[in-house]
Interface confidence: low
């Protein structure tokens, strides 16, 4: 999906008002020194591409993020503010239902959500120079 035509300010508002809290809740009790941010993004469409990938694509050691509150709110924000996004996700959602897994918070998931927080921070500050 090409995120170029999304309403970035509306997505930012959704993050600021709710998604950020859910990410903090998920990471509660985790020390900042545990993870290094290795995923970055260069502009807002790129950030949303990376956020979508980390949030919804199962990875080795973390298959359960899509059912978390922050993921559901992220999905809703993208569906509302990115034209045509919902249609691209129908097949992916059906595939996910078939392989639904028990929700488990693993260290790998915590690391992944830590990366997500970094991506969201970057998304919210598009004018900042790349570190």
């Amino acid at each position: 999906y090409d995120f170029t035509n999304c309403d970035f300010e509306k997505i930012k508002a959704a993050y600021l008002s709710t998604i950020s809290k859910d990410l903090i809740t998920y990471m509660s009790g985790t020390k900042s020194t545990e993870f290094n941010n290795t995923v970055s993004c260069s502009n807002r469409p790129h950030c949303l591409t990376e956020i979508q990938s980390l949030t919804f694509n199962p990875t080795a050691g973390c298959a359960s993020l899509a059912k978390e509150m922050f993921a559901m709110k992220t999905k809703a924000a993208l569906a509302i503010w990115c034209p045509g996004y919902s249609e691209t996700q129908i097949n992916a959602t059906q595939a996910m239902k078939k392989r639904r897994k028990r929700k488990v918070t693993t260290n790998k998931c915590l690391e992944q959500v830590s990366q997500l927080q970094g991506l969201w921070r970057r998304f919210n500050r598009p004018l900042l120079k790349q570190q």
Epitope: I24, T25, M27, S28, G29, T30, K31, S32, R121, R125
Partner: nanobody, 127 residues
């Protein structure tokens, strides 16, 4: 549930002092890289960033309008961030909010645009 509760506001005469507190529950300031800050909104005006503190290294930043008068600090053992406000002026009258997961740097301290999580605490400077 993640919550921030602001307190310490009140009515004070010009030149007076107040100390605002922002207490967090549902998460721990010290546990993660959360930058924490204060912003304010005066009646009929836009919200403006006042000050923030980086949880990584304790660096602090202030809006030009409060530099030298306000001091931000944190007590991780109490999970609370404070804003000590001295030499208060009538133009400091506003509803003060704290926010977490802000971007604490010179670029952004005057641009906090987070939706308020708490109810805020009202500061009125008047003779």
């Amino acid at each position: 549930e993640v919550q921030l509760v602001e307190s310490g506001g009140g009515v004070v005469q010009p030149g007076g002092s107040l100390r605002l507190s922002c207490a967090a529950s549902g998460f721990t300031f010290a546990d993660y890289d959360y930058d924490i800050g204060w912003f304010r909104q005066a009646p009929g005006k836009e919200r403006e960033g006042v000050s923030c503190i980086s949880n990584r290294d304790g660096s602090t930043y202030y809006a030009d309008s409060v530099k030298g008068r306000f001091t931000i600090s944190r007590d991780n053992s109490k999970n609370t961030v404070y804003l000590q406000m001295n030499s208060l002026r009538p133009e400091d009258t506003a509803l003060y909010y704290c926010a977490v997961e802000i971007h604490c740097d010179d670029y952004g301290v005057e641009n906090f645009d987070f939706d308020p999580w708490g109810q805020g605490t009202l500061v009125t400077v008047s003779s």
